[in-house]
Interface confidence: low
């Protein structure tokens, strides 16, 4: 073969030209329209897993490939028919027109064409196999897409039901909010009404207060007048008494002028015939200085001088050294009689000390010391106690041996703190010790876990603050 050329004609059909000597043979072959050229950009694995948006694209590609296969098959059949027809015609022509040696050439060309056809068929078979592989792969991908789609559909359904639930909840809440708004409006209206009523009430009260203020002014004036009248009356009474005593003395010279009786303690008051509980004026030993004290003439035989009382928290017991020295409070209520008086009194003769206690549960107890006295101020009113009996604990809640008295401004305790400041009140603090009857007064339900309350450890334990306490003294030989 001098020349064998493959080219394209103007209408795009493939033509095979064979040059043999002076003869050239041209074969026009039918062209496939839908055949993809080898250079077309096609990626076999272009379908992406779990990408439902490319599902339609994959189906379309599959259809295209099926069409290509069908067209290839048709083209092969056409090619075979075409070759057979041409061969018949050419063979007849060759037999008729050509010389004997041309027959050989034609047979060779025919063989050549058949070889080419076989080659083409093999190639197409390969293409078919590739297409089948690609089809299988696409089918698998389609299956994956199908599963992915199912999953997505399920999720969408779930989400839809969730959305429906939320919508229901939302509508329920909206209703609730509307109901609340209505309620709120009603409440606001009632509040406004109440406010108006209160304003009326306030204005009424203001007018009442004004009237009362006027009355108070008048009462104050009247009170001043009454006080003056009372003073004048007292003066008149005193004058009369003086006149009477003078006239009596003149009548009976044997009756000496009666000396005013003074009492050192409530035991003396009791012995003098005053057996009623109350406030009496007592006189310091070896002095004319007086002090008012409450006398208990009923408890345990009477004659008790009350030196301390707590009952309602009405008196502040966080006082100075001087205040504890001279006494403070109200003898008919909460009070401290005074360390100086008690010290002088208890150093004159032997006294007993009774401490009466009440808790918040209605229980009562007492501690009785058979000997009690306080040292002088120079020794910081140190407490001395002996012989404990009673129901408020077998161990003394006042530390033994006795300690010096301490106040917020007189720190004489055995502590590296200031017990009086920490626990409040003046007391015979140790470090700081198991008692403090002058601590903070705590009302009921606030009286537990209080380290600075009214404490008597060996009766009520740690942190319990008592309801009421009374400290009373009486001569041991009463």
């Amino acid at each position: 073969y001098n020349n064998f050329r493959k080219s394209m004609d103007s209408i795009g059909k493939k033509q095979y030209q064979v040059q043999h000597g002076s003869c050239s043979y041209t074969f026009l072959l039918p062209e496939m329209d839908n055949c993809r050229s080898s250079s077309s950009p096609y990626v076999s694995n272009a379908v992406q897993r779990d990408a439902p948006l490319e599902y339609d694209d994959s189906v379309q590609r599959l259809q295209v490939l099926e069409n290509i296969m069908e067209n290839n098959t048709q083209w092969l059949m056409k090619l075979e028919n075409y070759i057979q027809d041409n061969m018949k015609k050419e063979m007849v022509e060759i037999q008729q027109n050509a010389v004997q040696n041309q027959t050989a050439v034609m047979i060779e060309i025919g063989t050549n064409l058949l070889n080419q056809t076989a080659e083409q068929t093999r190639k197409l078979t390969d293409v078919e196999a590739q297409v089948l592989n690609q089809t299988t792969r696409l089918e698998l991908q389609l299956l994956e897409h199908s599963l992915s789609t199912n999953k997505l559909e399920k999720q969408i359904l779930d989400q839809t039901s969730e959305i429906n639930k939320l919508q229901d909840k939302n509508s329920f809440l909206e209703k609730k909010v509307l109901a609340m708004e209505d309620k709120h409006i009603i409440q606001l209206q009632s509040i406004k009404e109440e406010k108006d009523q209160l304003q009326v009430l306030v204005s009424k009260q203001n007018s009442i207060i004004e009237e009362l203020e006027k009355k108070i002014v008048t009462a104050t004036v009247n009170n001043s007048v009454l006080q003056k009248q009372q003073h004048d009356l007292m003066e008149t009474v005193n004058n009369l008494l003086t006149m009477m005593s003078t006239s009596n003395s003149a009548k009976d010279p044997t009756v000496a002028k009666e000396e005013q009786i003074s009492f050192r303690d409530c035991a003396e008051v009791f012995k003098s015939g005053h057996t009623t509980n109350g406030i009496y004026t007592l006189t310091f030993p070896n002095s004319t200085e007086e002090i008012k004290a409450y006398c208990d003439m009923e408890a345990g035989g009477g004659g008790w001088t009350i030196i301390q009382r707590r009952e309602d928290g009405s008196v502040d017991f966080q006082r100075t050294w001087k205040e504890y020295k001279v006494g403070f409070g109200n003898p008919s209520g909460e009070y401290w009689l005074g360390n100086e008086f008690v010290s002088q009194l208890t150093n004159q003769q032997r006294y007993v000390l009774k401490i009466h206690l009440k808790d918040w549960e209605g229980n009562e107890a007492y501690s009785l010391y058979e000997h009690f006295y306080l040292s002088s101020e120079e020794l910081n009113y140190r407490i001395h106690l002996k012989g404990l009996t009673g129901t408020a604990g077998k161990i003394s809640s006042i530390s033994q041996p006795g300690n010096d008295f301490s106040t917020k401004d007189g720190d004489n305790d055995k502590c590296i703190c200031k017990c009086s400041q920490m626990l409040t009140g003046g007391w015979w603090f140790d470090a700081c010790g198991p008692s403090n009857l002058n601590g903070m007064y705590y009302p009921q339900r606030q009286n537990t876990n209080k380290f600075n309350g009214i404490k008597w450890y060996y009766w009520k334990g740690s942190g319990y603050s008592l309801k009421a306490t009374t400290m009373m003294i009486r001569p041991a030989d009463f």
Epitope: I395, S399, Q400, K414, I416, C417, A431
Partner: antibody, heavy 121, light 107 residues
Framework: QVQLVESGGGVVQPGRSLRLSCAAS????????MHWVRQAPGKGLEWVAV????????YYADSVKGRFTISRDNSKNTLYLQMNSLRAEDTAVYYC??????????????WGQGTTVTVSS | DIQMTQSPSSLSASVGDRVTITCRAS??????LGWYQQKPGKAPKRLIY???SLQSGVPSRFSGSGSGTEFTLTISSLQPEDFATYYC?????????FGQGTKVEIK
């Protein structure tokens, strides 16, 4: 709750210094006396120093007098022990302790977990 | 300085035993004495204050007695958790002083 936490321990050469700290929480630190107590390895407890609630008074064991200084910062709720001229015999676990307690001031009631001081060359 | 002498320095006992530890002060300290329990690697824990007052939360099998110079700590019925070292402390004056300790071991 009431808590004391010591810090500042470590290994130090003889003659050198160290400062221990004790952080207090859960109680009114400024109202209570504070102590340092130590325990040498395998030995008993030894009281070291005390400082009054307001820092006005300080006492020391004879073994540390002139070398150790106890101090406090009530604004920081912290107790300190400045240890100078350290000796091998100062090797111990150092505890800070407070006089806080139920019927407090009856000796040390609240203790820290301790910090170890080792004096070695 | 007040010296505190504790005895014995160690003792072996069984669970359920009654144990007594004594502490002697070199001078009178009223009732200004506390008893402490210490377990290995732990901080001391106060059992008794004011010689005979039981610290809150401490079992009643522990008790203290004495005044002046002679003091006693008693464990009425020893329990497994009671095996530890016990110290007395005087807080009557500074410097405060501990006893040398009593180690209670299992027999």
């Amino acid at each position: 709750q009431v808590q004391l936490v010591e810090s500042g321990g470590g290994v130090v050469q003889p003659g050198r210094s160290l400062r221990l700290s004790c952080a207090a929480s859960g109680f009114t630190f400024s109202s209570f006396g504070m102590h340092w107590v130590r325990q040498a390895p395998g030995k008993g407890l030894e009281w070291v120093a005390v400082i009054w609630f307001d820092g006005s008074n300080k006492y020391y064991a004879d073994s540390v007098k002139g070398r150790f200084t106890i101090s406090r910062d009530n604004s920081k709720n912290t107790l300190y022990l400045q240890m100078n001229s350290l000796r091998a015999e100062d090797t111990a676990v150092y505890y800070c302790a407070s006089d806080y307690g139920d019927y407090f001031y009856y000796g040390m009631d609240v203790w820290g977990q301790g910090t170890t001081v080792t004096v070695s060359s | 300085d007040i010296q505190m002498t504790q005895s014995p320095s160690s003792l072996s006992a069984s669970v359920g035993d009654r144990v007594t530890i004594t502490c002697r002060a070199s001078q009178g300290i009223r009732n200004d004495l506390g008893w402490y329990q210490q377990k290995p690697g732990k901080a001391p824990k106060r059992l008794i204050y004011a010689a005979s007052s039981l610290q809150s939360g401490v079992p009643s099998r522990f008790s203290g007695s004495g005044s002046g110079t002679e003091f006693t700590l008693t464990i009425s019925s020893l329990q497994p958790e009671d095996f530890a070292t016990y110290y007395c402390l005087q807080y009557n004056s500074y410097p405060r002083t501990f006893g040398q300790g009593t180690k209670v071991e299992i027999k």
